[in-house]
């Protein structure tokens, strides 16, 4: 593997690790092969501190981040124990809500207007922030 | 100046493999990803497959997935394509191209001359 | 996958005309847009990125504009140089597709 000492040009870098914040939209999927192919994965939040960092220069615009549930309970990307981790929850989030209209549930989570995590349909468009750490060797990704 | 060099192109039967590089210079090559793309004769571009820069996460068209394998060595600034399985709809020049820094997206900026592909036999 | 529409697929012009190439996608793919110059035996050259952004080196008669799905490649005044094939390329998604392609030739 090889090893980053400093943040790539247009990352920032916050607490030893390296955040890209996209201008655009994708998909979950989508915003999730970008994150690996910069050799990283899509945001894992552990803490209030980290979640303020984010939502700081996210802004009060849909996000996506590394949690999931597609198969069956919610995980993050990098394989952070959901169970016992830090959450931010909506209140009523997650709800798997069918009513969209677009066929499933909501099992892609994402930050909303005002910080706080929604479960919603993966394939919305929405931004999303990619994050790795300094000082570790580059691991191959967990499947999903 | 930045430069890529592909070679390893050549004749080869249908079913068999081939092993293409692309040199690359004028740059850090271990800060970027890197791509192939083909073009038929007389046709157009088709994308093949890209790598991140470490190497470890790769992508590819549906078209070559399970037959092509992209790596790298960052060592000797090189990045491969393995050709196996090789089919007449294979046969192309095989272009590496430079994964651009652009702000989300899989651009390429940077391209060789490529190397061409003859499926026949 | 994202299919490009590239059109017009050949198209004759005279030295000083302004061309036009257009090329529209399948789905909204925000300003992820190459243009490309290819000569006959050459790889191709960027010469657009970013939908409207001009490559460093790139004369400034070639001008890139559009967002979304519908995209336009413009030359002001052709040169005999320009003779060659336009490509344009979405990158926002995998797999990266390109339009068909714009051959350009001189009347």
């Known amino acids: 593997g090889s090893e980053r000492t400093c943040c790539p040009v247009n990352w920032v870098e916050h607490e030893r690790s390296c955040y890209w914040f996209s201008r655009s939209g994708k998909a979950w999927a989508d915003a999730d092969n970008y994150c690996r192919l910069e050799d990283a994965h899509l945001v894992v939040v552990t803490s209030w501190e980290e979640q303020k960092f984010v939502q700081h220069h996210i802004g009060p615009v849909n996000t996506w981040m590394g949690l999931h549930d597609q198969n069956g309970p919610w995980k993050w990307v990098d394989g952070t124990d959901y169970e016992t981790g830090f959450k931010n929850w909506r209140p009523e989030q997650p709800d798997d809500w069918y009513g969209h209209g677009l066929g499933g549930g909501e099992d892609c989570a994402h930050f909303t207007d005002d910080g706080r995590w929604n479960d919603d349909v993966c394939q919305r468009p929405y931004r999303w922030v990619c994050e790795t750490e300094l000082d570790k060797a580059s691991q191959e990704p967990p499947l999903l | 100046q930045v430069q890529l060099v592909e070679s390893g192109g050549g004749v080869v039967q249908p079913g068999r493999s081939l092993r293409l590089s692309c040199a690359a210079s004028g740059f850090t090559f271990s800060n970027y990803g890197m791509h192939w793309v083909r073009q038929a004769p007389g046709k157009g571009l088709e994308w093949v497959a890209v790598i991140s820069y470490s190497g470890n996460n790769k992508y590819y068209a549906d078209s070559v997935k399970g037959r092509f394998t992209i790596s790298r060595d960052n060592s000797k600034n090189t990045l491969y394509l393995q050709l196996n399985s090789l089919r007449a709809e294979d046969m192309a020049v095989y272009y590496c191209?430079?994964?651009?820094?652009?702000?989300?997206?899989?651009?390429?900026?940077?391209w060789g001359h490529g190397t061409t592909v003859t499926v026949s036999s | 996958d994202i299919q490009m529409t590239q059109s017009p697929s050949s198209l004759s012009a005279s030295v000083g005309d302004r061309v036009t190439i257009t090329c529209q996608a399948s789905q909204d793919i925000s300003d992820y847009l190459n243009w490309y110059q290819q000569k006959p035996g050459k790889a191709p050259k960027l010469l657009i990125y970013?939908?409207?952004t001009l490559e460093t080196g790139v004369p400034s008669r070639f001008s890139g504009s559009g967002s979304g799905t519908d995209f336009t490649f413009t030359i002001s005044s052709l040169q005999p140089e320009d003779i060659a094939t336009y490509f344009c390329?979405?990158?926002?998604?995998?797999?990266?597709?390109f339009g068909q392609g714009t051959r350009l030739e001189i009347k």
């Open positions: 191209a430079r994964r651009s820094s652009s702000w989300g997206g899989y651009g390429m900026d940077v």
């Open positions: 390329q979405q990158y926002d998604n995998l797999p990266i597709t």
């Open positions: 970013d939908a409207s």
